[in-house]
Interface confidence: low
């Protein structure tokens, strides 16, 4: 399953590193019951399989080359030797699909699992009186989610297969040759280009990869995270794990721990600093959600955390799931605002970049016009926003995010539930009364959360005059980790919002920011601005600042300076 993917994407010196044991602190490692430890033929520890496990359910799968199981339960198989099984049955009354884990040494429905080693679940018909009966088994994670009936996979005629392979092989040789040549030329170009760029990289300057035109740059990373352009948005299916040495624990969330780490560059002492988010074995779902979000190449944006790769790590004591990303030394926005008072110019940069990041996330196209799946973050807060060295924001922690796939039904959206952090939840989320018919309503909840973050930034800006100690939104009204009920009292019953003292409005720029964020936290989701509109407003602020040409913290926007208020 894509085992060689990284060979074309990572620099060769990284690929040549072979499975170097990372130093993992003991408290991160997860123990596995002794009765679950089994070794494969090579003596490596074999971990329990992940399979779809819904037992028997009615199905609509009929007369199709392949079907999805529509089973929402991914299970850890009970024993390491178990594999994934799917059974499709049709009789006069109905069609059922069974998804389970099962030990291939034992018969299932009186049949031996002959195809247990297959990575795909390819259905084979079995003779059963009074019904049509197909069964398949496979041994890659969640492989029984996609069941394949297509004759193309039928291996029952070896002679025919031989002919197919011969014909295919001969006909593929010329294009294959061309493809290999192109890859070699491209690789040489990249290596050469990387060497030329490395000196600039050392000095910590921004690197941009220009694609399509000067106006359509995909910004690879900022001034700090020295990560080569070859290694973004990949899933590391290679058995050769990246040579990473964990350094210090820098954060701990609901589902994972985040470490500062060293990505070794080659046999020398050189390394790049990266962040590693480590999910324990049972938090696979969170890791998978975030990995799937990050894996969209069109997500790449200067205000969204740069993703390197995802890995499954097998330690002696258990399996872990890793996400490897850029590292930002300034930490998250909440920590930054706690420690620093910011200037008007800082506020403008932080606010503008935050809005641009969210606008990109919500957008259905890239800045270059390529189609992109809109995504909603659903847990926007100052601790899920990182501060880059140039004092711009980048969004992180997509564990609760949702891809607004047009194929999602209202039921699918309803099942995604009341998620997020109570303090930052929009009124309609607190009340569980979202308009699921309109995917825009999910974006409007993100905009509400963004407004609270903009208020946090503004509360620490010295342009307003007296700056109080950092306080989260509603900080004086609710306890440290408020529950949904207490937030309902504040936000719904009292229609409360964080206070905007009148002296903030003496600074015209801040006044405009406050007007903007007030429109973003409107009780009526439909009345809120879009993230794109907020980004445009910040751009106009910057433009007006340049026009007035005065120093950062002065009142400097002309009285008649009007802003576009379109949504």
């Amino acid at each position: 399953m894509g085992r060689g993917l990284l060979r074309g994407l990572w620099p060769l010196h990284i690929v040549l590193w072979t499975r170097i044991a990372s130093t993992i602190p003991p408290h991160v490692q997860k123990s596995v019951n002794n009765d679950m430890i089994v070794t494969d033929n090579n003596g490596a520890v074999k971990f329990p399989q992940l399979c779809k496990f819904c037992d028997v359910r009615f199905s609509t799968c009929d007369n199709q080359k392949s079907c999805m199981s529509n089973c929402s339960i991914t299970s850890i198989c009970e024993k390491p030797q178990e594999v994934c099984v799917a059974v499709w049955r049709k009789n006069d009354e109905n069609i059922t699909l069974e998804t389970v884990c099962h030990d291939p040494k034992l018969p299932y429905h009186d049949f031996i699992l002959e195809d247990a080693a297959s990575p795909k679940c390819i259905m084979k018909e079995k003779k059963k009186p009074g019904e049509t009966f197909f069964m398949c088994s496979c041994s890659s994670d969640e492989c029984n989610d996609n069941i394949i009936f297509s004759e193309e996979y039928n291996t029952s005629n070896p002679d025919l297969l031989l002919v197919i392979f011969q014909v295919t092989g001969i006909s593929l040789l010329p294009p294959l040759g061309v493809a290999i040549s192109v890859i070699i030329i491209f690789y040489c170009y990249r290596v050469n280009r990387q060497q030329k760029l490395s000196s600039t990289w050392e000095t910590g300057k921004t690197r941009k990869l220009m694609e399509f035109s000067e106006h359509c740059a995909i910004i690879l990373e900022d001034d700090r995270s020295d990560i080569s352009s070859t290694c973004a948005n990949n899933i590391n299916h290679n058995t050769e794990l990246l040579p990473i040495e964990l350094d210090t624990l820098v954060g701990k969330g609901r589902f994972a721990e985040v470490y500062k780490a060293k990505l070794k560059q080659n046999t020398s002492e050189q390394f790049e600093t990266v962040a590693v988010k480590i999910f324990p074995y049972e938090e696979y779902a969170s890791w998978k959600t975030e990995k799937d979000i990050f894996s969209d190449i069109n997500l790449k944006h200067e205000n969204i955390l740069q993703f390197l790769t995802a890995e499954e790590r097998k330690t002696e004591l258990g399996k872990q799931y890793w996400l490897i990303t850029a590292f930002h030394a300034k930490g998250n926005l909440q920590e930054y605002l706690t420690r620093h008072v910011i200037s008007w110019e800082d506020l403008r940069k932080l606010g503008s970049s935050l809005a641009r990041g969210i606008a990109h996330l919500h957008s259905d196209h890239t800045p270059c016009g390529r189609p992109k799946m809109p995504i909603v973050h659903r847990d926007l807060k100052s601790s899920n926003i990182l501060v880059k060295n140039d004092l711009t924001c980048c969004l992180c922690d997509f564990g609760l995010s949702l891809r607004l796939d047009p194929t999602l039904s209202v039921d699918d959206l309803a099942n995604s539930g009341q998620v997020g952090t109570a303090r930052y939840m929009a009124p309609e989320v607190l009340e569980s009364r979202m308009n699921l018919e309109n995917v825009e309503s999910f974006k409007q909840t993100d905009v509400y959360s963004m407004a609270l973050v903009l208020w946090e930034m503004t509360s620490r800006c010295n342009a307003v005059g007296e700056v109080k100690d950092y306080e989260p939104p509603f900080g004086s009204k609710v306890r440290e980790h408020p529950c949904v009920e207490s937030m309902k009292d504040n936000v719904l019953r009292d229609r409360g919002r964080p206070e905007i003292p009148s002296f903030w409005l003496n600074h015209q720029g801040i006044q405009m920011v406050c007007e903007t964020l007030t429109e973003c936290w409107d009780h009526d989701p439909e009345a809120r601005l879009t993230a794109q509109c907020v980004a445009e407003r910040f751009s106009e602020l910057e433009h007006l600042d340049r026009l007035s040409g005065r120093s950062c913290s002065e009142e400097k926007i002309p009285e008649d300076g009007s802003l576009n208020t379109t949504k």
Partner: nanobody, 125 residues
Framework: QVQLQQSGGGLVQAGGSLRLACAAS????????ITWFRQAPGKEREFVAA????????NYADSVKGRFTISRDNAKNMVYLQLNSLKPDDTAVYYC???????????????????WGQGTQVTVS
């Protein structure tokens, strides 16, 4: 497969405490996430608290946060729900349920649970 046997319900005065237990039979108990649900007469079954297989992650309904505590002892194949500061609203039949599904965002959905205890009555007067 796992079988769940519940104990520990009863009648208690408002403000009092109870401890519910959920005993599991079967191997590899530590790969099962356990969730407590409750069902009051004439109402739907509602989520109360959940704990992942390793016990690293717990989750509570807002209505019980700070009052109820879920814990597990994998050596004994037991999961416990400690009920403190009980209110009349807490009166219900309490069920423990097990799933091999990963913890994540579906813990509150009863359809994800393949294995259920028999239920135990908690009455707060």
């Amino acid at each position: 497969q796992v079988q769940l046997q519940q104990s520990g319900g009863g009648l208690v005065q408002a403000g009092g405490s109870l401890r519910l237990a959920c005993a599991a039979s079967g191997r590899s108990f530590s790969i099962y996430g356990i969730t407590w649900f409750r069902q009051a007469p004439g109402k739907e079954r509602e989520f109360v608290a959940a704990i992942t297989g390793s016990g690293l992650t717990t989750n509570y309904a807002d209505s019980v946060k700070g009052r109820f505590t879920i814990s597990r002892d994998n050596a004994k194949n037991m999961v416990y729900l400690q009920l403190n500061s009980l209110k009349p609203d807490d009166t219900a039949v309490y069920y423990c349920a097990a799933t091999r599904a990963y913890s994540g965002y579906y813990g509150e959905n009863p359809t994800r649970y393949a294995y259920w205890g028999q239920g135990t009555q908690v009455t707060v007067s």
